[in-house]
């Protein structure tokens, strides 16, 4: 279905195959201020009580081609003494993202949208739900 | 320049504006197995030592239209007794994702790629780097 009625300023496209054939400008627009981006620390992975590592996942037929994925370093969390705490678990926070995959493979101009589940970082959880008092 | 020599199976497109004008099939393919998707727990946000909430961010001129963003519940982390630990900070793990924005606004068939920084969850960090021993 067409999501929004077309106005005269919109390029024409067949409504019934709208979802299968949209035009996209892949020149990335940085809607983040460079200040916001530079303020975002990348050292949490070492300083966290549930530290993680990042591995490089590259697929030249995907946009973005390179995605860095998190893996938790330990099964347990690290306590204040730097020891593993066997009552607390280090778990991966995952996010579902959309990527573009070339279709057919190696064709530079046509893509399909695909969902991908990526690890973003780790957090420390207890086996019992607790609330701060 | 055309990135890959076009074969007859590839739809034609003008090489010199490759990035500005690609065709995308927006029918999302779920490349995640339903098992992988269903295994992904959503209760980490309550069980974490750095719990978070999720807020709904909706923009009809964006694809995906709805994005859930995390915010840390506390500035500090929650200890084993359920109290806030003033030596540990709860910090937001952010990820840069790509979204499609309608261009011009409200046109159903043309999009541009935009970067968006989203909060995915929270983790507990110390002010000193510690390593598990």
């Amino acid at each position: 279905a067409v999501l929004i009625p077309q106005s005269s300023v919109c390029p024409n496209a067949e409504a019934n195959n709208f979802l299968q054939n949209v035009k996209v400008n892949l020149k990335v627009i940085n809607s983040l201020s460079s200040k916001a981006s530079s303020r975002r620390p990348s050292d949490y992975l070492n300083r966290s009580t549930s530290p993680w590592t990042l591995s490089r996942n590259e697929d030249p037929d995907r946009y973005p081609s390179v995605i860095w994925e998190a893996q938790c370093r330990h099964q347990r969390c690290v306590n204040a003494e730097g020891k593993l705490d066997h009552h607390m678990n280090s778990v991966l926070i995952q996010q579902e993202i959309l990527v573009l995959k070339r279709e057919p493979e190696k064709c530079p101009f046509t893509f399909r949208v695909e969902k991908m589940l990526v690890g973003v970082g780790c957090t420390c959880v207890s086996s019992i739900v607790r609330h701060a008092s | 320049a055309v990135l890959i020599p076009q074969s007859s199976v590839c739809p034609n497109a003008e090489a010199n504006n490759f990035l500005q004008n690609v065709k995308v099939n927006l029918k999302v393919i779920n490349s995640l197995s339903s098992k992988a998707s269903s295994r992904r727990p959503s209760d980490y946000l309550n069980r974490s030592t750095s719990p978070w909430t999720l807020s709904r961010n909706e923009d009809p001129d964006r694809y995906p239209s709805v994005i859930w963003e995390a915010q840390c519940r506390h500035q500090r982390c929650v200890n084993a007794e359920g109290k806030l630990d003033h030596h540990m900070n709860s910090v937001l793990i952010q990820q840069e994702i790509l979204v499609l924005k309608r261009e011009p606004e409200k046109c159903p068939f043309t999009f541009r790629v935009e970067k968006m920084l989203v909060g995915v969850g929270c983790t507990c960090v110390s002010s000193i780097v510690r390593h598990a021993s």
Epitope: L26, V28, N30, S34, S37, S42, D43, L45, L54, S55, R56, E58, P60, Y63, P64, S65, V66, W68 | V2, L3, I4, P5, L19, E96, L98
Partner: antibody, heavy 121, light 106 residues
Framework: EVQLVQSGAEVKKPGSSVKVSCKAS????????IHWVRQAPGQGLEWIGV????????FYNQKFDGRATLTADKSTSTAYMELSSLRSEDTAVYYC??????????????WGQGTTVTVSS | DIQLTQSPSSLSASVGDRVTITCSAS?????IYWFQQKPGKSPKRWIY???ELASGVPSRFSGSGSGTDYTLTISSLQPEDFATYYC?????????FGQGTKLEIK
């Protein structure tokens, strides 16, 4: 104009460390990874590893794992390569080069001018 | 590790000659990249994704190949083409380069 400007030449003793910087300008620093490549005198090119300024991720050629440390400072758009436990075989020109994260077909498109590191007792 | 073997290692040719440099990979790779380097200078990206000429590279250069065998061809050698050319793969870690082909004036 895209530029990768590296720090000056270094002379180091065996067993010591060296830290080479690579200051980027003319583009969005976090859209590109920084790869490091070295070239010993009269020899070919050797890939050391990659740092992603956006996430802080690093990946190394196993040959350098444990000795090389790649970092980046987003606030100054500067990448760093530190090499420890230097030996005479590490005498080389060290290059930084950028690599577009979104569309990897382009490969390593811009290179720094190189930093000569000489290891000698 | 994927080994890239360039041949010849060095080549003497005259202005106007047609020159072909080959790069053979020890395993199949998806794309090859070529860099040009002149003495005392940084490498320059010359051909990317096997076929594509980098910005400013003259059309007398071309790239081809697939699988394990790739070539860089110069249809009519010019004085400014005398340099060392390296092939490079990034299909498998660690990323590797060929040993280089030095193109000299005869």
């Amino acid at each position: 104009e895209v530029q990768l400007v590296q720090s000056g030449a270094e002379v180091k003793k065996p067993g010591s460390s060296v830290k080479v910087s690579c200051k980027a300008s003319g583009y969005t620093f976090t859209d590109y990874e920084i790869h490091w490549v070295r070239q010993a005198p009269g020899q070919g090119l050797e890939w050391i590893g990659v740092n992603d300024p956006e996430s802080g991720g690093t990946f190394y050629n196993q040959k350098f794992d444990g000795r090389a440390t790649l970092t980046a400072d987003k606030s100054t758009s500067t990448a760093y390569m530190e090499l420890s436990s230097l030996r005479s075989e590490d005498t080389a020109v060290y290059y930084c080069t950028r690599y577009y994260r979104y569309e990897s077909f382009y490969g390593m498109d811009y290179w720094g001018q190189g930093t000569t590191v000489t290891v000698s007792s | 590790d994927i080994q890239l073997t360039q041949s010849p290692s060095s080549l003497s040719a005259s202005v106007g000659d047609r020159v072909t440099i080959t790069c053979s990979a020890s395993s199949s790779i998806s794309y090859i990249y070529w860099f040009q380097q002149k003495p005392g200078k940084s490498p320059k990206r010359w051909i990317y994704a096997t076929f594509e000429l980098a910005s400013g590279v003259p059309s007398r250069f071309s790239g081809s190949g697939s699988g394990t065998d790739y070539t860089l061809t110069i249809s009519s050698l010019q004085p400014e083409d005398f340099a060392t050319y390296y092939c490079h793969q990034r299909s498998s870690y660690p990323w590797t380069f060929g040993q280089g082909t030095k193109l000299e004036i005869k």
